[in-house]
């Protein structure tokens, strides 16, 4: 019989749980990557775009060597959640010019979503303690303008580009150690 | 045009050190990582690391840890490789070359530098 | 760290043939419909040129001549026909797991 139910499984094998946690993150890195550029395409944008409730990147020079899973993962984990949260409010705060974007949006939202549970789903195969965000998610305001929602969705999927790109490296380095 | 530029050919001794550059230009810098292979005579290619030039975070092929740094000038889209200790082993033909991010496929290369170490 | 053995090691071939270049994996480098290898081309004094990448993906600008397939373990660089800017030496490298790696090269000559 297996453990008892809502008691963590640790994994036999914590390796194919990370593979599959990656696999995951490069696929969504791949759909960002595509619909940033097809956001360069329809409204180009000079520049970094900065939103203030994003997260701050998470690695810096240096740090990665130091990494150990469980701050990855609960590093990762919050960070996705407010990118979700933030490709959530594009989606409903958008307007007329990004509505023709909808339909990706909602797919990597979906993905994000899925992404999200498989990462949860590896914290709890690992026993490690599922933590909540720092502080309490501050409510995202209406976009000053259509410009200001673009934005904004350009600030989005750069960040979650960068993000999901620290998250690979971070995780495949984090296998070799296992 | 894309293009990663590469500094020239350098002569060491065994034991001194070698920093290399690699200025970028006809694309936007932060976009992609920044991989080093290294290529010496009747050796295959082998992948040194590669940093992400947006924040300038490092990651190094275990056994090139210790001896390479990778850095970034992000001001003037350069990426710089410098390696320590440096022995004969080391004398081989050094690529930046620029990686698509979470992926390790390398679609743009320089032109090489080759280092040559002999006492 | 995956092993990549290319073979052959040299191949002789005419202008107008098709080459084929094997590339074999020490462990599977696929996974849910992505496999992580990628095929160079290099030519003496040159840098490596990006061919293919995620087993079967042109490149931009690279003739469609060139093709790659396999999964798992086993792939393959299909060249036809051949043409006289060909002949260079051909790497296969996985992405699969850190660190990235490449195959010892094939290098395909002229008859």
């Known amino acids: 019989p297996g453990p008892p139910a809502g008691s963590p499984r640790v994994s036999s094998d914590p390796r194919a749980d990370l593979d599959s946690a990656v696999l995951l993150t490069r696929s969504l890195l791949a759909d960002t990557r595509q619909l940033a550029a097809q956001m360069r395409d329809k409204f180009p944008a000079d520049g970094d775009h900065n939103l203030d409730s994003l997260p701050t990147l998470a690695m810096s020079a240096g740090t990665l060597g130091s990494l150990q899973l469980p701050g990855v993962l609960t590093r990762l984990r919050v960070d996705l959640m407010s990118y979700f949260r933030h490709v959530q409010w594009l989606r409903r705060a958008a307007g007329p010019s990004l509505k023709t974007l909808e339909p990706e949006l909602g797919a990597l939202q979906a993905r994000l979503e899925r992404l999200l549970r498989r990462l949860q789903l590896l914290m709890s195969r690992l026993a490690l303690p599922q933590a909540a965000p720092d502080q309490p998610a501050v409510p995202l305001g209406p976009p000053a303008s259509a410009w200001g929602s673009i934005r904004a969705a350009h600030a989005i999927l750069g960040g979650l580009h960068l993000t999901l790109d620290w998250a690979v490296r971070g995780l495949l380095l984090l296998k070799t150690r296992l | 045009e894309v293009q990663l530029v590469q500094s020239g050919a350098e002569v060491k001794k065994p034991g001194a050190s070698v920093k290399i550059s690699c200025k970028a230009s006809?694309?936007?810098?932060?976009?992609?990582?920044m991989d080093w292979v290294k290529q010496a005579p009747g050796q295959r290619l082998e992948w040194i690391g590669d940093?992400?030039?947006?924040?300038?975070?490092?990651i190094y092929n275990q056994k090139f840890t210790g001896r390479a740094t990778l850095t970034v000038d992000k001001s003037a889209s350069t990426a710089y490789m410098e390696l320590s200790s440096l022995r004969s082993e080391d004398t081989a033909v050094y690529y930046c070359?620029?990686?698509?991010?979470?992926?390790?496929?390398?679609?743009?290369w320089g032109q090489g530098t080759t280092v040559t170490v002999s006492s | 760290d995956i092993v990549l053995t290319q073979s052959p090691a040299s191949l002789a071939l005419s202008p107008g043939e098709r080459a084929t270049l094997s590339c074999r994996a020490s462990k599977s480098v696929s996974t849910s419909g992505y496999s992580y290898i990628h095929w160079y081309q290099q030519k003496p004094g040159q840098p490596p040129r990006l061919l293919i990448y995620?087993?079967?993906n042109l490149d931009s600008g690279v003739p469609a001549r060139f093709s790659g397939s396999g999964s798992g373990t086993d792939f393959t660089l299909n060249i036809h026909p051949l043409e006289e800017e060909d002949f260079a030496t051909y790497y296969c490298?996985?992405?699969?797991?850190?660190?990235?790696?490449f195959g010892q090269g094939t290098k395909l000559e002229i008859k």
């Open positions: 070359a620029r990686g698509e991010l979470g992926h390790w496929y390398f679609d743009v």
């Open positions: 940093i992400n030039p947006h924040n300038g975070g490092p």
């Open positions: 006809g694309y936007t810098f932060t976009d992609y990582n």
């Open positions: 995620l087993a079967s």
């Open positions: 490298q996985h992405s699969r797991d850190l660190p990235p790696t």
